[in-house]
């Protein structure tokens, strides 16, 4: 019989229900924005905005200061007071729409939904390792701002993204706001603008450059700005917007907008469609060929990548990559594939595709029919003409006007659909050693920390844990402070170590010591933990073998049994080859001689399942007693594996030595031609791994084996005669003298 060890699912080596408690802060209301500051002199802060209030926290998430930012018109509003005696506009709550650092000053800038979306500048005042906010400055000059031209109206109640860039001595605010007809009619915010902060902090310089959705499209064409960032010579905005100005406005797609970070102008504003797909390696029934599109970006983050992922993305280590979590539609509802997919866009490749698109628009010979695009911002035109014009005039350059690059940039899900039902709502990517880790928040309030690698058929988890008991979605914006990430969920801010919250979710020593080095996991007797959690026997260099099962569970007291042991940490080497003298198995008092691995039986084990097998030949000693006993595996002097060496003993109960007894055989005669069905009755006839009924030394083919009965078909006899009949179990004869009589056919 060829018994095989049952597979152990890989998931059995970890427990994602383990509770981790991470430092948190209760903000007293739904967190609307959050940003962190790390100064040159070890001072740091976390700024958390909720409706009508701004909290300043120390690096330990303890409250340092709190500022009333609304309601507008309320005498207690501390930011409103900075604008002098009012009224400044209609009264109402202040929802924070923008919270950014101006690193040049340094200062915090907050902009809310009230007071025409104006901003306030708060100089940072270090006090030891904490930071306080100076009295706010109102970034609004009444005499400069009119409803139709308002350089100081920054934030839209529908959402605004801001990236601050230093150019020379000036700070430029790259602003992108969602608009509709009502918002546009009220103090004219712009869709995309670049505004210079005035040196006296009295507001933003007039005459700023901007693009806005044209009035005729404002009702039907809505742009959501999902993320903005600055890297290299450019500022980028990521948008979700209708794929067409003229077609169904619910058919959305994702675009990357690129602006120069070195010149505060919008002539080189470029857009590129980003296409993310789930293309399963094995296509499921119902899934479209060529991959299922996931057109809607939910969250994004750009980061330099570690060596392994860099190689897989065909770039150099440390190069910047834009990561995006995409869903199938605004509701995020699934099609046939997973709820969320993650695509990676190397920035260098994005930039080249954009630059190439500009050349195609502007080079000669002209490519007929190539549109400049962005018809929601500007008059339609064909390349190389400027918007709204039939031809280039001699003193204008084709390159100095906004352009939608005609090609989209398509990528496939890095996780190959393995996020499954998880709805990702927050993303932050870090490089740890040469590993790239995605820290993801989910719709149900969990944090997933997963290595970003391409095309594996399983997820490499650093951790997967619940932030708290509320189960509220983790919010989109994530901030980093030192070696921690700050996630917001509901009214709470949580501080999560980038190395993971701990190691207790790894249940086996092998899984524990295979964890990434940066996690600092070690084995403490029977659990996985970080050194500070294990004052006793914490170590990172060896694991004992672990027996989980064996077969058979009984064997004959006389004769041999081929014993198969199942478990983990037997070998550490996929070949399962064992150096001489390293593995010692005893069953009761009796040794079990290791058997060489049968290479024909070696099966590739998928990484999602794991099991190791070890075979040995058990020959009981004469002193061995009948009855139950233990199986013990001791491994010593094994050469170390990649992560640890195997060393130690594992003991499992449940093996019994038995004495087979043969009580009756029938019939005792049969034809010489053979084929008589013999029934042998007794006790413990099925013990061990081998048995044979011999009729005159020739094997009687076994048809059925049970504890109390054997059935076999007799072999042909040489002559009519009475011949000896015997039963061997494990190669040893069962006591008793029996004969079988061959008769004429």
């Amino acid at each position: 019989e060829d018994w095989q060890c049952p597979r152990t699912p890989y998931a059995a080596s970890r427990d994602f229900d383990v509770k981790y408690v991470v430092p948190s802060f209760s903000a007293g209301g739904l967190v609307q924005a959050m940003v962190t500051y790390e100064g040159d002199r070890n001072e740091s802060a976390v700024f958390v905005a909720i409706r009508n209030r701004l909290h300043v926290l120390g690096p330990d998430l303890k409250s340092v200061q709190s500022l009333a930012t609304g309601p507008a018109g309320d005498p207690g509003c501390q930011t409103c007071a900075a604008c002098g005696p009012g009224p400044h506009g209609p009264p109402g709550d202040t929802d924070t729409k923008v919270l950014v650092l101006d690193p040049a000053l340094p200062a915090l800038v907050s902009c809310g939904s009230s007071l025409q979306g104006r901003c306030f500048l708060h100089d940072l005042e270090p006090q030891g390792t904490a930071v306080h906010l100076a009295a706010p400055a109102c970034l609004f000059s009444a005499h400069h701002n009119r409803p139709d031209d308002c350089p100081d109206c920054v934030a839209s109640p529908l959402g605004t993204r801001v990236t601050v860039v230093e150019q020379g001595q000036a700070s430029y605010f790259y602003v992108a706001s969602s608009l509709d007809a009502a918002v546009a009619a009220s103090f004219s915010p712009r869709s995309v603008s670049i505004r210079r902060l005035k040196a006296d902090a009295s507001g933003f310089a007039p005459g700023f450059v901007a693009l806005s959705v044209l009035p005729k499209h404002l009702v039907s064409y809505s742009i959501e700005y999902v993320h903005s960032f600055h890297t290299g010579a450019f500022v980028y905005f990521l948008t979700v917007q209708p794929a067409s100005v003229t077609d169904d406005p619910s058919a959305l797609h994702t675009r990357l907008a690129r602006l120069s970070a070195t010149e505060p102008e919008l002539g080189d504003y470029r857009e590129l469609v980003l296409d993310c797909r789930f293309a399963p390696k094995r296509r499921r029934r119902g899934a479209p060929e060529g991959g299922q599109p996931y057109p809607v970006l939910r969250v994004a983050h750009s980061a330099p990548v570690g060596a392994q992922l860099a190689t897989e993305l065909s770039i150099a280590e440390g190069q910047e990559v834009l990561f995006g979590v995409f869903v199938t539609g605004k509701d995020g509802g699934p099609g046939v594939g997973p709820n969320s997919v993650v695509c990676a866009f190397p920035i260098d490749l994005l930039d080249t595709l954009i630059d190439e698109g500009v050349e195609r628009c502007c080079e000669s010979p002209v490519h007929p029919g190539l549109r400049r695009g962005l018809d929601f911002f500007q008059s339609p035109s064909f390349c190389p003409n400027p918007p709204g014009l039939e031809a280039l005039s001699p003193n204008t350059s084709c390159r100095h006007f906004p352009l939608l690059v005609s090609s989209s940039f398509s990528r496939v899900d890095l996780f190959n659909g393995l996020l499954g039902p998880v709805q990702v709502t927050a993303l932050y990517v870090t490089r740890l050693d040469n590993v790239t880790v995605a820290h993801m928040g989910t719709m149900d309030g969990r944090i997933l920390q997963v290595e970003l690698v391409r095309s594996l058929n399983y997820l490499l988890y650093v951790s997967n844990f619940s932030l708290g008991d509320s189960g509220q979605p983790v919010q989109r914006d994530v901030s980093r402070l030192g070696d921690h990430l700050l996630f917001a969920s509901g009214d709470q801010v949580f501080q999560v170590p980038i190395q993971g919250p701990g190691c207790r979710h790894f249940l086996t020593c092998g899984r524990c010591l295979r964890a990434w080095h940066f996690m600092g996991c070690g084995w403490c007797g029977n659990m996985c933990g970080q050194q500070k959690e294990c004052p006793g026997s914490w170590q990172q260099d060896h694991c004992p073998p672990k027996l989980t099962e064996f077969h058979p569970h009984s064997g004959p007291l006389r004769g041999s049994t081929r014993l198969t042991l199942c478990g983990s940490n037997f070998y550490l080497h996929p070949s399962g080859l064992v150096p001489e003298g390293t593995h010692q198995v005893t069953v009761g008092q009796s040794p079990c001689r290791p058997l060489p691995k049968d290479s024909s039986k070696l099966r590739p084990v998928p990484r999602k399942d794991f099991v190791e097998e070890f075979e040995c030949e058990l020959e009981p000693l004469g002193t061995q007693a009948v009855g139950p006993t233990n199986v013990s595996l001791t491994v010593t002097n094994m050469p170390p594996g990649k992560h640890f060496r195997v060393d130690g003993t594992s003991v499992l109960r449940g093996f019994s030595f038995m004495e087979p007894v043969l009580i009756a055989v029938q019939p005792l005669f049969g034809p010489r031609a053979g084929g008589t069905c013999l029934t042998l009755e007794g006790q413990s006839l099925s013990v061990g791994t081998s048995r044979a009924v011999l009729v005159n030394g020739t094997e009687c083919l076994l048809a059925r084996v049970s504890e109390g009965q054997l059935l076999c078909a007799t072999p042909p006899g040489a002559t009519v005669a009475s011949v000896p009949l015997s039963l061997q179990v494990g190669g040893a004869q069962v006591p008793g003298s029996w004969t079988f009589q061959y008769r004429e056919d």
Epitope: R277, E289, P293, D348, D351, T352, E356, S407, S410, R411
Partner: antibody, heavy 115, light 108 residues
């Protein structure tokens, strides 16, 4: 007028090396992805390698990965392909091509790998 | 790595229509480009981004795409159209450009 001119081909023994060059003119070289494509005698087109303008992203066909290296010098408007550990099956005409559309091609340079 | 399969050869009489197909499991999600290669010459792009045509290519050449099949159509075929034709896509799962197996068009 856009022109791409390959050079550097020739006869080389198995295990040997060659460096191909592609000189570009008539267009702004730096913004474009540039690629090498080869065609064995009597066979179809086979993409070999591509590189972006900064050189920060390079990709290779599995058949040449680890043996060939693509590079470019934007100041000289030139694309290169360093070919090491050449094999008989690398015998082909090697073309350089412009852009993600491969909208312009050179006339090709013949590489023969034979002992 | 993905494969683009083309019909090896198509024969067509002058003035008739030639249709060349290209099948592959990542055509639906990617732009398809078509190239013409005459004996002893370098390839020339005749259709790009599924349906667009460079200005120097006659209007007789057109491209279309349905599901996982792209088609290059040449109407009113002329003797000068006799050549090998290749489709090509970008395979985003491997970061490779992939050419089709090629179709030889013979004008009878």
């Amino acid at each position: 007028e856009v022109q791409l001119l390959e050079s550097g081909g020739g006869l080389v023994q198995p295990g040997g090396s060659l460096r191909l060059s592609c000189a570009a003119s008539g267009f702004t070289f730096s913004p474009y992805i540039m690629s090498w494509v080869r065609q064995a005698p009597g066979k179809g087109l086979e993409w070999v390698s591509s590189i972006v303008s900064s050189g920060g992203w390079t990709t290779y066909a599995d058949s040449v990965k680890g043996r060939f290296t693509i590079s470019r010098d934007n100041s000289k408007n030139t694309l290169y392909l360093q070919m090491n550990s050449l094999r008989a099956e690398d015998t082909a005409t090697y073309y350089c091509a412009r852009g993600r559309l491969f909208d312009y091609w050179g006339q090709g340079t013949l590489v023969t790998v034979s002992s | 790595q993905s494969v683009l399969t083309q019909t090896p050869s198509v024969s067509v009489a002058p003035g008739q229509t030639a249709r060349i197909t290209c099948e592959g499991n990542n055509i639906r999600g990617q732009s398809v480009h078509w190239y013409q290669q005459k004996p002893g010459q370098a390839p020339v792009v005749v259709v790009f981004d599924d349906t667009d045509r460079p200005s120097r290519i006659p209007e007789r050449f057109s491209g279309s795409k349905s599901g996982n099949t792209a088609t290059l159509t040449i109407i009113r075929v002329e003797a000068g159209d006799e050549a090998d034709y290749y489709c090509q896509v970008w395979d985003s799962s491997s970061d490779h450009f992939v050419f089709g197996t090629g179709t030889t068009v013979t004008v009878l």
